[in-house]
Amino acid sequence: EINGSANYEMFIFHNGGVQILCKYPDIVQQFKMQLLKGGQILCDLTKTKGSGNTVSIKSLKFCHSQLSNNSVSFFLYNLDRSHANYYFCNLSIFDPPPFKVTLTGGYLHIYESQLCCQLK
Amino acid sequence: EINGSANYEMFIFHNGGVQILCKYPDIVQQFKMQLLKGGQILCDLTKTKGSGNTVSIKSLKFCHSQLSNNSVSFFLYNLDRSHANYYFCNLSIFDPPPFKVTLTGGYLHIYESQLCCQLK
């Protein structure tokens, strides 16, 4: 069950790499975000809050990532044509409830100008 | 962060197929269980409770599965040697809190006697 295409610019290119933006509602305090390439888990990040509001960030599959109050950005480097694929942000919301799982995504097109090391 | 090998018999062979058993504590009411082959999501099942305690079972990646009050079984059929791999049960517990993610697994060995269609 795929909830749909991202309703925002999901891919931001810079310096032969790409930032993949996975948004979540900023009211959400505890969640898991997975980046899927096709059906494969590339990256994931889990944010939980313990007693005393201590925040814990964990990754089962680590990628360079950046967390804000309404998004997780995953960074892929050294782009080549094999990176072209469907990418999905798989969000599991845990707190505040209700528990909700959403999958949104888009196709990453790789053009010559975005490749890491273009042939001169 | 892999929590470890399954401390139970994870693979049950029958009729050229395999039942992969993914256990969860029977106190758990809402969860997501993914079956991973290596780093790839093969199957997943999410159990949530809606208003009026209605139970909802959803799959982003559907496999033949069976849900009990403390396990999810995923069934793979027509086994061949390419099925040999590490398989992981990736459990995300949502209710009751605290939110927790555990990954347990083991290696699926494929022996001649377990293949679907042995050469006579």
């Epitope: 509602p25 809050k49 409830p97 209700p98 | -």
Partner: antibody
């Protein structure tokens, strides 16, 4: 069916406190968070804050920070909103609203009937 | 704080006519929700996630928009549609409502 039933109207003196209740039925109380929203006479709606019932985490609108306290009693499936140091401009209808999510955002899917609080000397 | 400005403040139309209500955000938001409120009643969810129809809401209601500009459309007004309509954004803290558009019978 899913219902949120709020306590009755209150008349309060400036400087005092008021505690409004919201009793949930028709669903598992801990499976959803609860928001509070208010509406002053002839005015628009204003989000005050929420409580995540099972974790007790709260999130308040900074405008009310320090004056509002949202709590919940799981045993009676009741959420509470207490507002202290009342002034005349706190005269409003106070609503509880249940949290829900779409694919992208969150919203209030079920509302209480409202509780009128009048602050007057 | 993200300010939501609804226009017009009052809209006078007859049953059967088409109503278009606007909501403009002071900065970009990811989605908009719409609520209907009748006198003496609590608000009722109409549209969530910009364009999704809430449970039990008739198909004559629709929502659209992105960024800072969002619209609620009622294709053919029924007598029970005359009420106050509020837009709401939950993508930027503190979460805010528009001041409302009153839809009245001409």
């Amino acid at each position: 069916q899913v219902q949120l039933v709020q306590s009755g109207a209150e008349v309060k003196k400036p400087g005092s406190s008021v505690k409004v209740s919201c009793k949930a039925s028709g669903y598992t109380f801990t499976d959803y968070a609860m928001h509070w929203v208010r509406q002053a006479p002839g005015q628009g709606l204003e989000w005050m804050g929420l409580i995540s019932i099972y974790s007790d985490h709260t999130n308040y609108n900074q405008k009310f920070q320090g004056r509002v306290t949202i709590t919940a009693d799981k045993s009676t499936s009741t959420a509470y909103m207490e507002l202290s140091s009342l002034r005349s401009e706190d005269t409003a209808v106070y609503y509880c609203g249940r949290n829900n999510y779409g694919n992208y955002g969150w919203y209030f899917d079920v509302w209480g009937q409202g509780t009128t609080v009048t602050v007057s000397s | 704080e993200i300010v939501l400005t609804q226009s017009p403040a009052t809209l006078s139309l007859s049953p059967g006519e088409r109503a278009t209500l606007s909501c403009s955000a002071s900065s970009s938001v990811s989605y908009m929700h719409w609520y209907q409120q009748k006198p003496g009643q609590a608000p009722r969810l109409l549209i969530y996630d910009t364009s999704k129809l809430a449970s039990g809401i008739p198909a004559r209601f629709s929502g659209s928009g992105s960024g800072t500009d969002y619209t609620l459309t009622i294709s053919s007004l029924e007598p029970e549609d005359f009420a106050v309509y509020y837009c709401f954004q939950g993508s930027g803290y503190p979460y805010t409502f528009g001041q409302g558009t009153k839809l009245e019978i001409k």
